[in-house]
């Protein structure tokens, strides 16, 4: 590919060094921190941006599940092994041996164990609730604008195609966006739902992975959508194994 | 042209540094990966790291991490490769490289020999 | 980290003949984002550096001769010399660049039967 060939960036990643090193001197634009050469006319992997982002401060999470297999990201950042695709291997483990199972989205999906640990396969999220509180405003944002807004920009910014985007449920002050995408739905060329979702959290919190794009600027007919809270829910095709104790806690 | 030059023979006591430089020209020094790679006597290539000078950024082989320090002074367009800790299994030559799909340009090595 | 394995580790073969050399990994190495494999081919002679002869798995550096070919996809990769010559003798790595750390075979060694 040639990434904007005049002066060699990656419009979609910023988290990249480009060099006119590829096949006949062409721009070529390779992730930091797994040196993998990157699509720059569309997402990086979520695994290679959190490769990337590894000295980034821990983010912990901690808040209700909306359904008792969802998951919610509360380990934060790590530094995770991704597969010559870019994505996820299904089994991660930190400097000290310590082992886990993590979903195509790379969130823990089993207890810690060592390195005895077997993840047989990389269990796909097919489900991605994105559940955001937005700041007062004058009045509620009307649901069918608000819905056509949030299609759109993941339509257009995202790259995901609006198929995925099952639903928008709108109760002030409360936004949930529904993402669905099966194995078998998901085409060669489609943006997958959960760099689509990763992609919006980093938006959200004023830490865009575009290149020298200004950061998100949600309006609805004009009006700001000021985001305060997000928190994501992640479903998997088959459900996470964790201990009874993990459960009850 | 594209030229590497690196600097001469080295020959160093157990626990001490080395510090290799390896000099670009016919290029801009600034926008390519440029790569070291060790060659033991006999033996096949390891890479060792690689620095882009026009961001500092510097990846290392974990097998080299905390011995190896790669540099570059972007005003004489030289790249450098530190070793320190050097015990004898680091008698090698050393090479630089710019890297890329079709950067087919290597330094001439630095022989560097650890002994007591 | 992949691994890179090269068979046969030497190769001895008459001036003329085809040579093939084969390099495996232990991952895939094609890039689905641009369909490209990174997987390069050196050669290099005693007392020297390493000489770029193939890239991207099968496309020659310029100035190599043509009897030099790459071929493979994924995880095999293959390079053939059409017509040995004498000053082919040389040993041959090939080179993953995919993904840090980028790692080589261990090479074949060339010589002539």
């Known amino acids: 590919h040639t990434a904007a060939q005049d002066n060699c960036t990656c419009p979609t990643n910023k988290m990249t060094v480009c060099s006119p090193d590829g096949p006949g001197g062409r721009c070529q634009c390779r992730a930091l921190g797994s040196g993998m050469a990157v699509d720059c006319s569309t997402l990086t992997s979520k695994c290679l941006l959190l490769k990337a982002r590894m000295s980034a401060p821990k983010n912990a999470r901690t808040l209700v599940r909306p359904s008792e297999h969802a998951l919610v990201d509360n380990d934060g950042l790590y530094d995770p092994d991704c597969d010559p695709e870019g994505r996820f291997k299904a089994r991660q483990c930190n400097q000290t041996s310590v082992c886990w199972c993590v979903n195509s989205v790379g969130v823990r999906r089993t207890d810690k164990g060592d390195l005895s640990l077997r993840c047989d396969e990389l269990v796909r999220t097919h489900h991605i609730l994105i559940d955001l509180r937005h700041r007062p405003t004058a009045g509620a944002f009307n649901h069918s604008d608000l819905d056509a807004e949030l299609r759109r920009l993941f339509r257009e910014r995202y790259r995901l195609h609006p198929k995925f985007v099952a639903a928008v449920h709108y109760e002030q002050p409360t936004i949930q966006i529904e993402l669905r995408q099966n194995t078998s739905q998901k085409a060669a060329g489609d943006v997958d739902i959960g760099d689509a979702a990763y992609y919006f959290e980093r938006d959200i919190k004023g830490e865009s992975l575009f290149q020298g794009r200004g950061g998100l600027d949600l309006r609805v007919r004009g009006e700001p959508l000021q985001v305060e809270r997000t928190l994501i829910y992640y479903l998997d095709e088959i459900p996470p194994k964790f201990s009874m104790k993990r459960l009850t806690a | 042209q594209v030229q590497l030059v690196q600097s001469g023979p080295e020959v160093k006591k157990p626990g001490a540094s080395v510090k290799v430089s390896c000099k670009a020209s016919g290029y801009t020094f600034t926008i390519y990966w440029l790569g070291w790679v060790k060659q033991a006597p006999g033996q096949g290539l390891e890479w060792i790291g690689n620095?882009?000078?026009?961001?500092?950024?510097?990846n290392y082989n974990e097998k080299f991490k905390g011995r190896v320090t790669i540099t570059a002074d972007t005003s004489t367009s030289t790249a450098y490769m530190e070793l320190s800790s050097l015990r004898s299994e680091d008698t090698a030559v050393y090479f630089c490289?710019?890297?890329?799909?079709?950067?087919?340009?290597w330094g001439q090595g630095t022989l560097v020999t650890v002994s007591s | 980290d992949i691994v890179m394995t090269q068979s046969p580790d030497s190769l001895a073969v008459s001036l003329g003949e085809r040579a093939t050399i084969n390099c495996k990994s232990s991952?895939?190495?094609?890039?689905?984002?641009?369909?490209?494999?990174?997987l390069a081919w050196y050669q290099q002679k005693p007392g020297q550096p390493p000489k770029l002869l193939i890239y991207?798995?099968?496309t020659r550096e310029s100035g190599v001769p043509d009897r030099f070919s790459g071929s493979g996809s994924g995880t095999d990769f293959t390079l053939t010399i059409s017509s040995l010559q004498a000053e082919d003798v040389a040993v041959y790595y090939c080179?993953?660049?995919?993904?840090?750390?980028?790692?080589f075979g261990q090479g074949t060694k060339l010589e002539i039967k």
């Open positions: 991207g798995a099968s």
């Open positions: 620095i882009f000078p026009g961001s500092a950024y510097i």
């Open positions: 490289a710019r890297e890329g799909s079709n950067s087919g340009y």
């Open positions: 991952q895939s190495l094609l890039n689905s984002g641009n369909q490209q494999n990174y």
């Open positions: 080179q993953s660049d995919h993904i840090y750390p980028y790692t």
